[in-house]
């Protein structure tokens, strides 16, 4: 209960702070619990204590280790453990995922991103910010403090964010980066009774013997991906795998997201080479979700050839 | 948030009925269907049917046909699920769950014991 | 109905693995899958929506792959949470189907 992971890059401040807390004034021993051997308070040393924290400037690779801490008072002794693990850095841009804090989630309505431990170390603004290792740029993204701010949150915001800062410690400076996982967490997401967009109903098609037809059948059903949405076509009140007709197929179109964020979707009937009694069937346009089914249907004509006679 | 929050658990005889409800908060009641799903006891998950909340369409599993009915109260965010002719192995852990980008919001769940 | 079938049914696994669940559909259901965590005593979780979306607050050491009738959730390094039941639930098609689950223990 009373240890804490902590971890950092070698090369990089790192500070960690006690996970037993105690008033100021309660002296704190730090230990390399390894070798029971005290932590020094000098601040000229590269690892040293400084009350509750203790602080790596930088840190090493060896420095990795179980750290115990003892909050001293007048009354009792309180023991806690930092289990520090320092990594070398990567090379390439992916961040593993022992390097990772913990995922944080934002909305259209709170897009915030908190510098994981920030507030352990002396740092001076600006914070730089980095999302899936490129500098942020543009005016959606705003350093704000201790956070960064996306404007106009959309899904493709999810990613690694890794914030940079410099923490300065009697006028030396170090560098400290810190990622964490951003998802977007849609709280419009809703669903509709089904709305078919195409085709209109009762819509007459004109199409001419011997050649090709498509109609499309198109369809939303609220915001955000659906569960259990569907659009299709029925002949005659059958579905087309059951019609037994190959010239007629169905193929699914593309899922739409158009720009004011309703799921679509689109089915498109393939007529090879319109026969005269293709004109006789009924052609059904089928949406439906966990609301219930919308039907349009549709009926085919010909098309009148040009007169050119007249 | 949305937040569903399930009736406590029953204890039932052999042919009689339960009725276990379901109270929504957060979010739009009518912009969701809500799903039952049961685990009887070291089982996984089976699917039992559907409800809209926007016009009370539902959808029963063909297993629970004629046995179950799903109704919901919109005034007060609160759908129900009874299941009737109850049987031993109707014994399981109920839970309703949000269902419109996935089944992204459970109920806690609640124990119907079916035993003579 | 379209059955899921999961395997493994069970694993062993220490902290630090990679852990790989597989869930094969009786056809074809496009993006329509689904993963859910379930700790005992407790409600299931969504995971991991339309095959690869991290739910709210999911570590991203979670995550989906797959298409049609084959899909995996992989779980990057195992932490001690990771220990539960994790199900994949397809719903392309009406009734929605759960694969049996895979429970993953502490070797």
């Known amino acids: 209960k009373f240890s804490k992971q902590s971890w950092g890059l070698e090369n990089e401040a790192l500070i960690v702070r006690c996970p037993r807390q105690g008033k100021p004034s309660y002296t704190v021993d730090w230990y390399y619990s390894q070798t029971n051997k005290s932590i020094p308070t000098q601040e000229r040393n590269r690892v040293f204590a400084s009350g509750q924290l203790l602080k790596f400037l930088p840190a090493a690779v060896a420095d990795s280790g179980i750290y115990t801490c003892i909050v001293r008072s007048p009354t009792f002794n309180r023991t806690g453990y930092a289990n520090v693990t320092i990594y070398k850095k990567q090379s390439d841009c992916n961040v593993p995922d022992y390097l990772m804090y913990s995922t944080v989630s934002g909305s259209e309505k709170n897009s915030k991103i908190y510098c994981p431990t920030i507030d352990l170390y002396n740092w001076t603004a600006p914070l730089e910010w980095f999302k899936n290792c490129q500098a942020l740029q543009g005016s959606r993204y705003r350093a704000h403090k201790s956070f960064l701010v996306i404007d106009n949150v959309m899904t493709e915001d999810a990613g690694d964010y890794t914030c940079k800062f410099i923490h300065n410690e009697n006028g030396a400076n170090y560098s400290v980066t810190a990622t964490r996982s951003f998802t977007v967490k849609d709280e419009q997401g809703f669903s509709l009774f089904p709305v078919i967009g195409a085709p209109a109903q009762n819509e007459i098609k004109e199409v001419e013997i011997g050649k090709n037809a498509n109609l499309t059948c198109s369809a939303c059903f609220g915001k955000g991906t659906q569960f259990l949405a569907a659009v299709l076509w029925q002949l005659n009140g059958t579905k087309i795998t059951d019609f037994g007709e190959p010239r007629i197929q169905q193929e699914e179109g593309q899922n739409q997201s158009f720009s004011n964020g309703l799921a679509c979707l689109d089915m498109v009937l393939r007529i090879a080479d319109v026969k005269e009694e293709d004109l006789l069937l009924q052609y059904d346009c089928l949406a439906l979700n966990l609301h219930g089914l919308r039907r349009h249907t549709v009926r085919l004509s010909r098309k009148n050839p040009i007169d050119h006679h007249s | 948030q949305v937040q569903l929050v399930q009736s406590g658990a029953e204890v039932k005889k052999p042919g009689s009925s339960v009725k276990v409800s379901c109270k929504a908060s957060g979010g739009t009641f009518s912009n969701y269907a809500i799903s039952w799903v049961r685990q009887a006891p070291g089982q996984g998950l089976e699917w039992m049917g559907w409800?809209?909340?926007?016009?009370?369409?539902?959808n029963y599993a063909q297993k629970f046909q004629g046995r179950v009915t799903m109704t919901r109260d919109t005034s007060t965010s609160t759908v129900y699920m009874e299941l009737s002719s109850l049987r031993s192995e109707d014994t399981a852990v109920y839970y309703c769950?949000?269902?419109?980008?996935?089944?992204?919001?459970w109920g806690q769940g609640t124990l119907v014991t079916v035993s003579s | 109905d379209i059955q899921m079938t999961q395997s493994p049914s069970s694993l062993s696994a220490s902290v630090g693995d990679r852990v790989t669940i597989t869930c094969r559909a009786s056809q074809g259901i496009r993006s329509n899958l689904d993963w859910y965590q379930q700790k005992p005593g407790k409600a299931p979780k969504l995971l991991i929506s339309i095959v690869s979306n991290l739910g709210s607050g999911v570590p991203s050491r979670f995550s989906g792959s797959g298409s049609g009738t084959d899909f995996t959730l992989t779980i990057s390094s195992l932490q001690p949470e990771d220990f539960a039941t994790y199900y994949c639930?397809?719903?392309?098609?009406?009734?929605?189907?759960f694969g049996g689950g895979t429970k993953v223990e502490i070797k």
């Open positions: 769950a949000r269902s419109t980008n996935a089944l992204d919001y």
């Open positions: 409800i809209s909340a926007y016009n009370g369409n539902t």
């Open positions: 639930l397809q719903h392309n098609s009406n009734p929605p189907t």
